[in-house]
């Protein structure tokens, strides 16, 4: 189904727990690695093992893990050994929740608010720092001002607007509409001493199957930066999309199954059917990523207990003009993305 978790890739069966503290050795030195690295399923990161020896397919959520077979760091997973007391040898990959942040070498705890300087108030939310400006420039440059400048005023924290062509000022001056002025920023608008800010959605945490995407927004009653999340499924893991590429074409940017299906999540089923579009694949060195998309709310009904709703990425179109070297490392190409904004809301 459209939102089913990716299948686990490699599992370890823990030895029976004994009343002993002897731990098995998972690392061997010198390193013994296969001649060629493994081929990981689409969406699973190829990483160096915990022994710092060999390339392995990262363990996924719910998989067993050891000091050698480590959990996928790109998905915010860690190895939870709490079920293997007292040996702490074999754990289960779990999601990191409420991680702290590091900014300019200073560590902040999850939920902590701080002022890195006099101009911003920031909050650490699950590893991401969201900030709101404290300098709300009350008087934007006037319409007649062709070259406005923000200048530092001695003894004051916030910069002030100055206009170099004051001498040519017309008799009647008009203030810029503060909304129009603020809207010139990407996603900022001014309301009641709060500059609303919403970051772009992060890339989906998986290249196939169910993943998560996050963003920081302070568009709320308290003007407080909060992390928002949505489910995402760029493409199904169990469909070979290459088979659907038309003759003479190098890409199938969008794959859309014939049948409408229900989304499923943790045993709960969406209250209506959907026929989503997924990003496709190319036969050359290009990757397809969402280009035109939106966020929809999906209602789920559970067999026992109350239902719930989740925000879900809804893909309308995908862009396939980005080179991608390693499809298994979902962050391998972030630095090479061109200035290409995803059209999304």
């Amino acid at each position: 189904t459209a939102l089913s978790p990716t299948p686990t890739t490699m599992t370890f069966t823990p030895a029976p727990l004994e009343e002993t503290t002897t731990r098995p050795e998972f690392c061997k030195w010198p390193c013994e690695c296969p001649q060629s690295p493994p081929r990981c399923p689409l969406g699973v990161s190829l990483i160096t093992d915990g022994c710092e020896c060999c390339k392995i397919c990262a363990q996924q959520l719910g998989d067993n893990c050891t000091e050698a077979a480590i959990c996928d760091p790109h998905r915010g997973l860690y190895c939870d050994y709490s079920g293997d007391r007292p040996r702490y040898a074999i754990g289960v990959c779990a999601q990191v929740v409420g991680v702290g942040c590091v900014l300019d070498g200073v560590r902040y705890t999850n939920g902590e608010s701080f002022q890195p300087n006099c101009r911003y108030n920031c909050t650490c939310i699950d590893g991401t720092v969201g900030c709101t400006p404290l300098c709300l420039s009350p008087r934007p440059p006037r319409l007649w001002c062709r070259q406005p400048r923000h200048v530092r005023v001695p003894g004051q924290c916030c910069e002030q607007w100055v206009c170099d062509d004051d001498a040519r000022r017309p008799r009647q001056t008009a203030l810029l509409d503060t909304r129009a002025f603020a809207a010139s920023g990407a996603v900022e608008q001014r309301y009641e001493n709060c500059i609303a800010y919403t970051s772009p959605w992060s890339p989906c945490s998986t290249t196939c199957g169910l993943g998560i995407s996050t963003r920081i927004s302070n568009v709320n009653a308290r003007c407080w930066p909060e992390q928002e999340s949505r489910l995402c499924n760029l493409r199904p893991c169990d469909v070979d999309i290459q088979l659907h590429i038309k003759a003479g074409k190098k890409c199938l940017a969008v794959y859309q199954p014939e049948e409408a299906t229900n989304f499923t999540l943790a045993g709960c089923v969406s209250t209506r059917t959907y026929r989503p579009k997924y990003c496709g694949v190319c036969t050359d060195n290009r990757c397809c990523i969402p280009y035109k998309s939106k966020t929809i709310s999906v209602d789920f009904q559970c067999p026992e207990g109350p239902g719930f709703s989740r925000q879900v990425l809804w893909i309308n179109a995908c862009f396939c003009n980005l080179s991608c070297r390693n499809p298994n490392d979902i962050f391998a190409d972030l630095e090479s993305y061109p200035d290409f904004e995803e059209i999304a809301n």
């Epitope: 003479g248 890409c251 940017a253 969008v254 190319c282 397809c288 035109k292 179109a317 003009n321």
Partner: antibody, heavy 121, light 113 residues
């Protein structure tokens, strides 16, 4: 009802560039793409370029490659067509037209009113 | 010249039936891509008349019909009326090694006698 409103007529010198805008209402650029088609005086329709939903990239007609740039601004639901190094042969009416982002949907549902671009010496 | 070919002109008396042909190749119409038809009245922008070979958008009279076979297609207009006098263009999609292109026929001028 989907409507496309284009910018006004332009007179340009040979060798200059022109940028024509196309404002969409009644739908959003999240759900469709805008293509550009031109028509020289007394001649037929000539497709210039637009986003190819199935190829996942902006594609251009062979005749215009390297000279035309098509862009979309989703925040204002406006599309732009930028044509460089104008010659007298570029004197034409330039139309924007919509294509729904649906597999296999290769036709133009709605058209703008057209923008006349005249290239003079 | 156009990748897709149309006759430059056709004519007919009011009430008559006329057809306009549209001939392509194996990289467009013959490759299975649909044919669409547009009507352009004098001094106005083109308007979608037939999509997907034979489908009419709402508001288009059933006097207009389209069909496709192999590498060609045709538009038929029955019960010809004076207001049908216009230019008619067929359009398809062309996928070749040089890339993807939307292709128009050269246009056919319909004169109502």
């Amino acid at each position: 009802e989907v409507q496309l409103v284009q910018s006004g007529a332009e007179v340009k010198r040979s060798g200059a560039s022109v940028k024509v805008s196309c404002k969409l209402s009644g739908d959003t650029l999240t759900d469709l793409s805008i293509h550009w088609v031109r028509q020289a005086p007394g001649k037929g329709l000539e497709w210039m370029g637009g986003f190819d939903f199935e190829d996942g990239e902006i594609v251009y007609g062979d005749k215009f490659k390297g000279r035309v740039t098509v862009t979309e601004d989703p925040s204002t639901d406006t599309a732009y067509m930028d044509l460089k190094r104008l010659t007298f042969e570029d004197t034409a009416i330039y139309y924007c037209a919509t294509i729904k982002d649906i597999p296999g949907r290769y036709y133009f549902d709605f058209w703008g009113q057209g923008t006349l671009v005249t290239v003079s010496s | 010249q156009s990748v897709v070919t149309q006759p430059p002109s056709v004519s007919g008396a009011p009430g008559q039936r006329v057809t306009i042909s549209c001939t392509g190749s194996s990289s467009n119409i013959g490759a299975g891509y649909d044919v669409h038809w547009y009507q352009q009245l004098p001094g106005t922008a083109p308007k979608l008349l037939i999509y997907g070979n034979s489908n009419r958008p709402s508001g288009v009279p059933d006097r207009f019909s389209g069909s496709k076979s192999g590498t060609s297609a045709s538009l038929a207009i029955t019960g010809l009326q004076a207001e049908d006098e216009a230019d008619y263009y067929c359009q398809s999609y062309d996928s070749s090694l040089s890339g993807s292109n939307w292709v128009f026929g050269g246009g056919t001028k319909l004169t109502v006698l």
